[in-house]
Interface confidence: medium
């Protein structure tokens, strides 16, 4: 092909090229064909005769103002045609005659201000009608029943002000599962109009200036329809009273999507009407008071998103939102609950009673005042499910004996990002008989008891990442009740002593992280005692991240027992030379981290073992040697080998001797070294 | 208000020890951790450690540890910076420093505290 | 330890114009802990920016921080007087903290 687009099954991209015309020398079996961002201004149908398998043509972001009839023609099996971003702005009734076999057609961003005549009548097969961000100032799409398939018509961002019954009947054979009307200037919803439509299962009227009276005339056109999705995103709903929603009463809504409203007064039974609500979006927006009897009715909601729903109005404490005791005592389905991001001033003792059903409850970044967890905070949710609580950025500096006591369901618990600051007794979790998980990374300090984890021996993921851990190397370890444990993460605390029965026991690890810490004094020989050996036993470890640690020195027994070990992240350490043997016992290892240490040498008795059935190597920025005896062997294998080694060429370069230095350590000629045989395997 | 007050500056001969003090007021000694920063002339900031004055517990840069020596008394509200064996590489200026939240960023600094090493 | 480098070394503008000084560390900083601190000749420190794009009590709307990952802004978006000095970036993500080198913003 003597145009640049590229050609792989069946699909040819022509994209961005600058092409003026159509290609007409590509694989005449093409199926798939984008042509979008060149500076077509017209698509001859002649040129596409060759193409006649086409099942999808995108000629988006182009100059084209006439579409000719005859391409459909030669186009029989086409079922997605995007004209997005071109410069139509008439349509006739030929321009898609032929077009019989659409399923898609994308309109969007061109110039058409009307619709004259039928131009649709054809496309009996059309599922989705994309004419949104030209000029329409009706949704008048023809004059006789037609589109019987349609399932989608998008009209966002148009000048559309009224919508009509005789202008939306042509789609009284239609079941309408998207009415897109976004982003226009609708002032009126004249009676019927929304039942001139065979069937309107979702309406979607975000950025619409609709306020709470004409919201209100909406929902009674909605009544006796089929909506189950009704979308009213920023349409200036600033308050909502117990009519507001009345029409939906005879409607089986599932989905209501009241975000970005400003919405600052929701009236007691404001949603009464709504038995069968399942989906509730509420986020962002400006409530000042939830009223006890606001969330009434909403017997059937399972997810609840009241993210950024509750801001304070100044800096003044007057100012703070509130949120009546039992609340959402009415909310009896209600599985998922976000309430991050908001002003809440604290939890109160019924804040969240009646909860029956909840699994999931997101309060991160959710309260202005919550610095102390007591036995009290979570009293509301004794008789909840709670499967993930989430606590997250919430300036909590204490957790009191028993705060989750309540929460015997709880299986992920989420303290990370907080300022707690404080010695763990090990009664903070009592109660916790079914967790799998704590997050406490990124708090202020942790100082450990041999009883910490005492009360939790179910847990499998343990979190402490940067909480300055205190008294890790405490003998009995605090660690030694957590048999089931298979996550440790230990990381960025500049750890300086552990002891060696740190992990006994803990034989069920599977991953460990203890980067970013100061552990090279353990492994010295010189260590007072000698080192210590802190990985034994772990003979289910799958990876182990031993990054910036400053070690200088490895034990040659060190990984002995981990035999399951699949990554071993070793970088930015000052290690130069390796035991023989170290990593004989690694049969799984699958990737090797070395990068930024001091490494000259790379040889078989040290690496053989490690490299054999790896498919991932890091050895970026190091000093290699490339003399014979330290990287002849290391040199063959990298020829050989199909294991990835990223950067292979720019980053693996060689430090001595001097006329070597910077040279590619993959181009160090190995054929005048003794004993450079084939690389053996 | 809030604030620490460092020490006099000093000058001392290399191998001498030296300790300097800084002391909390305004505010609850123990609630905040507090971190020592170097500044050699002419040069930028280097974060040497932090202690917890409520029970003393210590963190140290792994390019300060076994250098200096940081510990605090609680009961006068004070944090102590410490050397055994001064070296004239140790001339610098030193700030005690609060640190604030999570730990980490310093919302409150002494003064500083001069030291000079010099034969 | 995590390096932080910061770029330019001077930046050499006049009163009222825009600031915009860059801080990239060497690893990737997944959660946030980024402050930026003011410092003028003979005095200590000053906190601006923690968290990567908070403002801290007391320090004018001007000052303004962004970024994440490696790479972190602090834009001054119209220069007065009393801000030229050295500004210095800080990482707490590890609790090894380290200091950028500093930028030095000076009277052109």
């Known amino acids: 092909s003597t145009t640049k687009c590229t050609v792989s099954h069946e699909v040819a991209d022509c994209s961005h090229l600058k092409l003026t015309q159509v290609p007409d020398d590509l694989p005449t079996n093409i199926t798939v064909l984008n042509l979008t961002h060149n500076q077509l201004r017209r698509l001859p149908a002649a040129n596409f005769t060759r193409y006649s398998q086409l099942t999808s043509l995108d000629v988006g972001f182009n100059t084209i103002s006439k579409l000719e009839p005859e391409l459909c023609q030669k186009l029989p099996m086409l079922k997605v045609l995007n004209l997005q971003h071109n410069e139509l702005s008439q349509l006739s009734d030929k321009t898609f005659a032929f077009c019989t076999n659409l399923t898609e057609l994308h309109l969007m961003s061109n110039s058409i201000q009307k619709i004259k005549n039928n131009p649709f009548v054809k496309q009996k097969n059309l599922i989705t009608l994309d004419l949104s961000h030209n000029g329409l100032s009706s949704t008048k799409l023809g004059t006789q029943v037609q589109l019987e398939n349609l399932q989608e018509l998008l009209l966002s961002n148009n000048k559309i002000q009224a919508l009509k019954s005789e202008e939306l009947d042509i789609f009284a054979n239609s079941s309408l599962k998207k009415l897109e009307l976004s982003s226009n200037q609708i002032k009126e919803f004249s009676p019927g109009c929304f039942h001139a439509i065979g069937r309107l299962f979702g309406l979607f009227l975000n950025n619409v200036q609709l306020g709470p009276s004409l919201t209100e005339k909406l929902c009674l056109e909605l009544a006796n329809t089929s909506i189950r999705n009704l979308s009213l995103s920023n349409s200036q709903l600033s308050t909502t009273s117990n009519t507001t929603f009345l029409g939906l009463k005879w409607t089986n809504l599932t989905m209501l999507d009241l975000s970005y409203n400003n919405l600052n007064v929701v009236g007691n039974d404001s949603f009464a009407w709504l038995p069968q609500l399942e989906y509730f979006f509420l986020e962002y927006n400006n409530i000042q008071h939830l009223f006890s009897h606001s969330l009434h009715g909403l017997f059937n909601v399972r997810y609840l998103n009241l993210k950024r729903s509750f801001t304070k109005q100044s800096i003044s404490l007057a100012s703070l939102p509130k949120i009546d005791d039992f609340s959402f005592q009415w909310l009896k389905c209600l599985e998922h609950l976000n309430m991050e991001d908001n002003d809440i001033p604290g939890i109160k003792s019924n804040m969240f009673t009646g909860l029956i059903n909840l699994k999931y409850l997101s309060l991160s970044n959710s309260f202005t005042s919550l610095r102390t967890l007591t036995n009290e905070t979570f009293v509301s949710l004794a008789h909840s499910p709670l499967h993930i609580l989430n606590l997250t950025k919430n300036k909590i500096s204490k957790i009191e004996s028993d705060a989750f006591s309540w929460l015997g369901h709880l299986e992920v618990l989420d303290l990370g990002l907080n300022e707690i600051g404080q010695e763990l007794t090990g009664q903070e979790w009592r109660g916790l008989e079914n967790i799998f998980e704590i997050y406490l990374s990124y708090n202020k300090y942790l100082q450990l008891t041999r009883n910490s984890f005492a009360l939790v021996p179910s847990l499998q993921r343990l979190m402490l990442r940067r909480v300055a851990l205190k008294n890790v190397d405490s003998s009995p370890s605090p660690f030694q009740p957590l048999r089931n444990l298979t996550i440790l993460d230990l990381s960025n605390n500049n750890i300086a002593n552990i002891n060696d029965d740190m992990l006994e026991g803990l034989e069920k690890l599977e991953i460990l992280d203890l980067q970013h810490n100061n552990l090279a004094r353990l492994w010295k020989h010189a260590n007072p005692g000698g080192p210590i050996y802190f990985l034994k036993g772990l003979s289910h470890l799958h990876i182990l991240n031993l990054e910036s640690n400053g070690f200088d020195e490895i034990p040659v027994e060190v990984f002995k027992d981990l035999f399951e070990l699949k990554i071993i992240d070793l970088g930015l350490n000052n290690l130069n030379t390796l035991p023989a043997s170290v990593f004989n016992n690694q049969v799984s290892l699958k990737s090797l981290n070395l990068q930024k240490n001091l490494i000259t040498s790379v040889e078989k008795k040290v690496f053989g073992p490690a490299f054999r059935n790896l498919t991932e190597l890091d050895m970026r920025f190091n000093p290699f040697d490339c003399t014979c005896e330290s990287i002849a062997w290391f040199v063959n294998w990298i020829n050989e080998t199909h294991t990835n080694i990223p950067e292979l060429s720019s980053h693996y370069l060689c430090n001595t001797p001097p006329h070597y230095h910077g040279f590619p350590v993959r181009l160090f000629d190995t054929s005048s070294c003794k004993d450079s045989a084939p690389f053996e395997l | 208000g809030v604030e620490l007050v460092q020490s006099g500056a000093e000058v001392k001969k290399p191998g001498e020890s030296l300790k300097i003090s800084c002391k909390g007021s305004g505010y609850s000694f123990t609630d905040n951790w507090i971190s020592w920063v170097r500044q050699a002339p002419g040069k930028g900031l280097e974060w040497m450690g932090v202690i917890d004055p409520s029970d003393s517990y210590t963190n140290y840069a792994p390019s300060f540890q076994g250098q200096v020596t940081i510990s605090a008394d609680k009961s006068i509200s004070t944090a102590y910076l410490q050397w055994s064996s001064l070296k004239a590489s140790d001339t610098a200026m030193y700030y005690c420093?609060?640190?604030w939240g999570i730990g980490g960023m310093v919302d409150i600094w002494g003064q500083g505290t001069l030291v000079t090493v010099s034969s | 330890d995590i390096v932080l480098t910061q770029s330019p070394a001077t930046l050499s503008l006049s009163p009222g114009e825009r600031a915009t000084l860059s801080c990239r560390a060497s690893q990737y900083i997944d959660i946030s802990y980024l402050a930026w601190y003011q410092q003028k000749p003979g005095q200590a420190p000053r906190l601006l920016i923690y968290?990567?794009?908070s403002r801290a009590t007391g320090v004018p709307a001007r000052f303004s921080g962004s970024g994440s990952g490696t790479d972190f802004t602090l834009t001054i978006s119209s220069l007065e007087p009393e801000d030229f000095a050295v500004y210095y970036c800080q990482q707490y993500y590890s609790l090894s903290i380290t200091f950028g080198q500093g930028t030095k913003v000076e009277i052109k």
């Open positions: 968290d990567a794009s």
């Open positions: 420093a609060r640190e």
